[in-house]
């Protein structure tokens, strides 16, 4: 999906209002310096591409993020503020349902969510205003 035509300010507002708090809850008890951030993004569409990938694509050692509250709210925000996003996610949703039934917080998941926090921070405040 090409995130170029999303309403970035509305997504930012959704993040600051709710998603950020859910990420903090997920990370509670984890030190901010515990993980090295290896994923970065260069502009807002790229940030959303990386956020979507880390949030919804199962990875080795962390298959369960898509069922977390922050993930569901992220999905809702993208569906509302990115034209045509919902349609592209139908197949992905089917696969996600098959992928995992239970929620397990592993160290790998905590590391992934730490990466997500950095990506969201970057998305919210790109130094050069990308439209």
């Amino acid at each position: 999906y090409d995130f170029t035509n999303c309403d970035f300010e509305k997504i930012k507002a959704a993040y600051l209002s709710t998603i950020s708090k859910d990420l903090i809850t997920y990370m509670s008890g984890t030190k901010s310096t515990e993980f090295n951030n290896t994923v970065s993004c260069s502009n807002r569409p790229h940030c959303l591409t990386e956020i979507q990938s880390l949030t919804f694509n199962p990875t080795a050692g962390c298959a369960s993020l898509a069922k977390e509250m922050f993930a569901m709210k992220t999905k809702a925000a993208l569906a509302i503020w990115c034209p045509g996003y919902s349609e592209t996610q139908i197949n992905a949703t089917q696969a996600m349902k098959k992928a995992r039934k239970s929620k397990v917080t592993t160290n790998k998941c905590l590391e992934q969510v730490s990466q997500l926090q950095g990506l969201w921070r970057r998305f919210n405040r790109p130094l050069l205003k990308q439209q």
Epitope: K10, S32, S40, N124, R125, L127, L128
Partner: antibody, heavy 120, light 111 residues
């Protein structure tokens, strides 16, 4: 605990340059915008610019665009601000500051400040 | 650039009194229903300290006697009952539009 420690006071001649350092600890340096703000004696706060350590991208106040250079060394978790062609009006306390956790655009961690005096 | 005008320049009050500081922006600092205006306190020889973010949210460790309100172009910082340690200079700052700008400051002094 997130902390920023700046280099010591500097006395410079007009026309010369100064490079102030800001060493970060207690947070993932590469993912936070780092800003520089100055304050002339008895005056208010003036934004110089910012840098994103992740890729070195910068944003400057137009007033300083030609004279200020912001850089980072990720290996030592240090941000630098170099100001060239110094004049007496550049006499000020220079602060580095970290932008907040969420990208709201406020500064939640500040360095202690570096006094730069420009005098002939 | 967005110009932030703070008033009054100096406010003389006594401990226990209520302080009301104003910050007016030359254009709106709102975006998608959020107001990107922040407030700082600065004491002599110290860096500024965050008081309030996004107009009305208390910074970490800030006492509840501090509160903020406003949206668009008009914002207010209120200190309900002044403590001796509250006498300082207060700055507003906007981030909605580059470049980031600060107000010129309001000095709160003991009467």
């Amino acid at each position: 605990e997130a902390q920023l420690v700046q280099s010591g006071a500097e006395v410079k001649k007009p026309g010369s340059s100064v490079k102030v350092s800001c060493k970060a600890s207690g947070f993932t340096f590469s993912t936070y915008n780092m800003h520089w703000v100055r304050q002339a004696p008895g005056q208010g706060l003036e934004w110089i610019g910012a840098i994103y350590p992740g890729n070195g991208e910068t944003s400057y106040n137009q007033k300083f665009k030609d004279r200020a250079t912001l850089t980072v060394d990720k290996s030592t978790r240090t941000a630098y601000m170099e100001l060239s062609s110094l004049r007496s009006e550049d006499t000020a306390v220079y602060y580095c500051a970290r932008e907040d956790d969420y990208g709201e655009g406020y500064f939640d961690v500040w360095g202690q400040g570096t006094t730069v005096t420009v005098s002939s | 650039d967005i110009v932030l005008t703070q008033s009054p320049a100096t406010l003389s009050l006594s401990p226990g009194e209520r302080a009301t500081l104003s910050c007016r922006a030359s254009e709106s600092v709102d975006s998608s229903g959020l107001s990107f205006m922040h407030w700082y306190q600065q004491k002599p020889g110290q860096p500024p300290r965050l008081l309030l973010y996004r107009a009305s949210n208390l910074g970490s460790g800030i006492p509840a006697r501090f509160s903020g309100s406003g949206s668009g172009t008009d914002f207010t910082l209120t200190i309900s009952s002044l403590e001796p340690e509250d006498f300082a200079v207060y700055y507003c700052q906007q981030i909605n539009t580059d470049p980031l700008t600060f107000g010129q400051g309001t000095k709160l002094e003991i009467k």
